[in-house]
Interface confidence: medium
């Protein structure tokens, strides 16, 4: 039988009546064009919906926008288009929502051709009121908020000017011309690349990287010969052209660009790219593209300085020019990442790591599934996950994998069971232990979302026909109930729930089509009466994360510590609630060699946990360039894995001595660095 439809499933009592009383329909009386939806703030219940109807004319685009606001999680909407003077809003800029709970919103308007600048509408009270502001420039990008101060905005103009506002878009100042890329760093710092002669494209590889820490009063050139730059965690990366040829290398800084070190990564040529796949304050996952149009590259993981890298995964799928990769951080369990590799026969296979890239393995075959036609051996195969690449290839995959930090251990994804990803119609699979084991959850493709920190999972079948049924589960996808939310089926376009998976409301978006017109419609369902009571202590059970063999004393030790979580029992039908906080108890483990990566000049042979000296460096003094100084490294080959908390046990010795000699890569010597003031 299909998952969740056998006799064992406990039914939720009287759910139809309870849900019917909590289903709210809203019909939007405007033409069906495009719709975009944004949540304003956290736990505020405020949603903004922008509907846009385009009429492409020969000379310009004529359009009409409508703006709606809800303050009850989408149950009711009010048309507030008059607050933006019925102006046509440019959908490509979306709605720029301020960080945290600032309540700030910026909408960018379309203005007629001859105007000297663009126009924005600003709100700082969760979209209750808007102020119209005419800009002294035409924006090229969406307004970017400083993460530290939501009053500080930056934007690039169509003429490559870098514009900054210090009063939430009221007044703007051009702080620099000829700017290609700009990003906020920490402490209201702005990093940007600038060209000297031609243009961003023409000067690629000859750009300069600049920094301002005072919103444009003064500047410091922190890099030259720049191709591109990126920020990840506490790391600033720059790809820099080599002196003699067209190759480029990654340089890294952990002090906002004051000092740089060359990353121990392969250089790349003109047609290749680097990509920061994931970064935190401990380390970074870096993809380095292979030469040629291969569609794959290598994942490297860094040390705590972003300088020494270990090869993590070969043949990592990442389409040329940095198009699509399936790399996914499983946020419901630390250390877990999923991605795809392109095997020698050009088939695509899914790999998973549970230890932050230390080891990668195939996903275990779900127990309730058969191997498909891609499997050579019908008894031995793996689960393969559909992610961004499958979606880009227009396979029947409506959603990428889903996990939430507060729904511990839960991962939901489309997949197929075989030797590789299949082009056949996928099913939906769930893991409740962070990816170690999987179960088929739903037959065929579905949209899905997590509510109440995992207490409820909601799904809607992906179909070309109109739909009127929603499915929900209160036991992490084992058993499913179906609810008909409307008599008149709608063409479904999307599920919307508040980010963070704490809400108990879900909005189903779609449109109705009659002979003459089509209209947007939303149905918001509140599940609060399904989970009638608040969860108590007895509803939770202790779960040891990363546990695969309770008999093994290392069981659960990942990155040097174990974590026990209090998790909701599958059989408990109760509310975690909006204030639910994940309860976890960490315990440190003794160190083993598994807790160390190989140091500069060392590598791990296949299937060995000992680090051995690279043959070409045997007998040589290990000297390398760090922060512009020549360093001498005394090591027995190991360096603690970033974020590893083990104590006791193995403790390989390492010592770095400053040789008091200056060294630079071709990138930037201190004398090339200069400061300027406006």
């Amino acid at each position: 039988s299909a998952p969740g439809e056998d006799e064992e499933c406990g039914r939720v009592r009287d759910f139809v009546a309870k849900l019917a009383n909590n289903t709210h329909q809203h019909v939007f009386d405007d033409l069906r064009g495009s719709v975009s939806l944004s949540w304003v703030g956290d736990s505020t219940g405020v949603i903004l919906v922008l509907t846009t109807f385009h009429v492409p004319l020969v000379i310009m685009t004529f359009g009409q926008s409508k703006l709606y606001r809800s303050e009850d999680y989408g149950k009711n909407f009010k048309d507030i288009t008059d607050l933006i003077n019925n102006t046509f809003i440019r959908t490509e800029f979306g709605m720029a929502i301020g960080p945290e709970n600032s309540g700030k919103v910026v909408l960018t308007a379309e203005v007629s051709g001859g105007s000297r600048g663009g126009r924005i509408f600003r709100s700082s009270d969760f979209a209750k009121n808007f102020v119209q502001t005419d800009l002294p420039f035409h924006p090229l990008t969406q307004m970017m908020y400083s993460p530290q101060n939501s009053d500080y905005l930056l934007a690039l103009s169509t003429e490559n000017g870098l514009w900054v506002s210090k009063n939430f878009g009221g007044k703007w100042e051009e702080i620099h011309k000829a700017v290609c890329l700009a990003k906020w760093g920490s402490d209201n710092t702005i990093f940007f690349t600038t060209y000297a002669n031609g243009s961003c494209k023409a000067d690629l590889g000859a750009l300069e990287l600049w920094r301002t820490s005072d919103l444009g009063k003064s500047f410091k050139t922190i890099g030259v010969k720049i191709y591109s730059f990126g920020l990840g965690g506490r790391f600033l990366f720059a790809s820099v052209m080599a002196d003699k040829d067209t190759t480029r290398r990654i340089h890294v800084s952990t002090d906002q660009g004051d000092t740089w070190s060359m990353a121990q990564l392969p250089s790349v040529g003109q047609e290749q790219f680097y990509s920061i796949l994931a970064a935190n304050d401990d380390m970074v996952f870096m993809h380095v593209d292979e030469p040629g149009d291969t569609g794959f590259g290598t994942i490297f993981t860094s040390d705590d300085r972003g300088i020494v890298y270990s090869k993590s995964l070969d043949r990592h799928l990442y389409t040329t020019t940095g198009g699509e990769t399936d790399f996914t951080n499983v946020t419901s369990l630390r250390g877990v990442y999923i991605t795809s590799v392109l095997s020698e026969d050009n088939s695509i296979q899914t790999m998973i790591t549970f230890d932050q890239g230390g080891r990668w393995t195939h996903l275990r075959k779900p127990e309730n599934s058969e191997c498909d036609a891609t499997a050579k051996n019908k008894n031995e195969c793996s689960l393969h996950i559909h992610a961004s690449y499958s979606i880009s290839q227009k396979l029947n995959v409506p959603m990428a994998p889903l996990s939430e930090p507060n729904a511990v251990g839960i991962v939901i994804a489309h997949g197929s069971v075989g030797d590789a990803i299949s082009v056949m119609v996928p099913d939906v699979y769930i893991s409740d232990d962070g990816g170690y084991s999987w179960t088929k959850m739903l037959e065929g493709p579905h949209y899905y979302t997590i509510l109440d920190s995992g207490g409820i999972i909601v799904a809607i079948e992906h179909s070309s026909r109109p739909i009127n049924v929603i499915k929900f589960s209160t036991d992490e996808g084992q058993c499913w109930q179906t609810y008909t939310f409307t008599r008149d089926p709608i063409y479904f376009t999307g599920l919307a729930s508040e980010p963070g998976a704490r809400s108990m409301n879900i909005s189903i978006w779609g449109f109705t089509e009659s002979f003459a017109t089509s209209q947007w419609v939303s149905y918001t369902i509140d599940f609060k009466d399904i989970l009638e009571r608040n969860c108590e202590e007895k509803d939770y059970t202790i779960w040891l994360a990363h546990s695969t063999d309770p008999e093994d004393y290392e069981d659960g030790c990942i990155l040097g510590y174990k974590e026990q979580f209090l998790r909701l029992r599958k059989s408990s039908v109760c509310q975690n609630g909006r204030d639910y906080v994940v309860t976890k108890q960490p315990s440190i483990c003794l160190c083993s060699l598994e807790d160390f990566l190989c140091d500069f000049g060392y590598y791990r042979p296949e299937n060995d946990s000992k680090c051995v000296e690279q043959p070409e460096l045997k007998g040589h003094d290990l000297e390398f360039c760090l922060y512009g100084r020549e360093e001498h490294l005394t090591t027995n080959g190991y360096r603690k894995i970033p974020g590893d908390k083990c104590q006791g046990g193995v403790n390989p010795v390492r010592e770095v001595k400053d040789l008091k000699k200056k060294c630079t890569s071709n990138f930037l010597s201190p004398e090339k660095q200069n400061s300027k003031s406006n």
Epitope: E554, C646, V650, N651
Partner: antibody, heavy 129, light 107 residues
């Protein structure tokens, strides 16, 4: 020979802080972890926490979290244990003890424990008003 | 945290006799267990680590055995200098924890 020499006895008032030092000699200071263990009068041994002299990373027992700080000074091969908000129950002998870790003898990947092979002479801390 | 329970609390043995001390863990600690001896006014002294390996300079009359949750320290023939308090300690998971101790006294 390998030695751990601790600072002298201390008498403190409730609410005050105490900082005990432990100077290591006779081995490479950064190659071994250091634990702190205390023993109240007539009671058993109680592990307080551990410090890795290489990077200074620490792990404390839950009971002392927020009150204890372990630090090290590699230039003098000394580790320190500071305990704040002292109460009468903190009256005890405080020991530093070396963890004789190394590349694991029991196979490279296993987590192997070597015990605490060298102990300081102990520092008596009396908390009294 | 892992709770270590030692028994008996006191063991009365005559010199030359065999002494068997027991230590039980509330969950498996594999072989990550050490035994210490402490005499009045002195710091503890490591006897056994890894559940069964004698530390440097420890006489052969001391032996350790066990794995998982049950451990034993055996002193084959008690000498006068062996009368002391003995502690077991686990280091499988932080926080490291000690047993309450077994006092070996002269009968």
């Amino acid at each position: 020979q390998v030695q751990l020499v601790q600072s002298g006895a201390e008498v403190k008032k409730p609410g005050a802080s105490v900082k005990v030092s432990c100077k290591a000699s006779g081995y490479t200071f950064t190659s071994r972890y250091m634990s702190w263990v205390r023993q109240a009068p007539g009671q058993g041994l109680e592990w307080m926490g551990i410090i890795n002299p290489v990077g200074g990373s620490t792990s404390y027992a839950q009971k002392f979290q927020g009150r204890v700080t372990m630090t090290r000074d590699t230039s003098t091969s000394t580790v320190y244990m500071e305990l704040s908000s002292l109460r009468s129950e903190d009256t005890a002998v405080y020991y530093c003890a070396r963890d004789p870790s190394g590349i694991a003898a029991a196979g490279p990947a296993s987590r192997y424990y070597y015990g605490m092979d060298v102990w300081g002479q102990g520092t008596t801390v009396t908390v009294s008003s | 945290e892992i709770v270590m329970t030692q028994s008996p609390a006191t063991l009365s043995v005559s010199p030359g006799e065999r002494a068997t001390l027991s230590c039980r863990a509330s969950q498996s600690v594999s072989s990550n267990l050490a035994w210490y001896q402490q005499k009045p006014g002195q710091a503890p002294r490591l006897l056994i680590y890894g559940a069964s390996t004698r530390a440097t300079g420890i006489p052969a009359r001391f032996s350790g055995s066990g794995s998982g949750t049950e451990f034993t320290l055996t002193i084959s023939s008690l000498q006068s200098e062996d009368f002391a308090v003995y502690y077991c300690q686990q280091a499988r998971l932080g926080p490291w924890t000690f047993g309450g101790g077994t006092k070996v006294e002269i009968k």
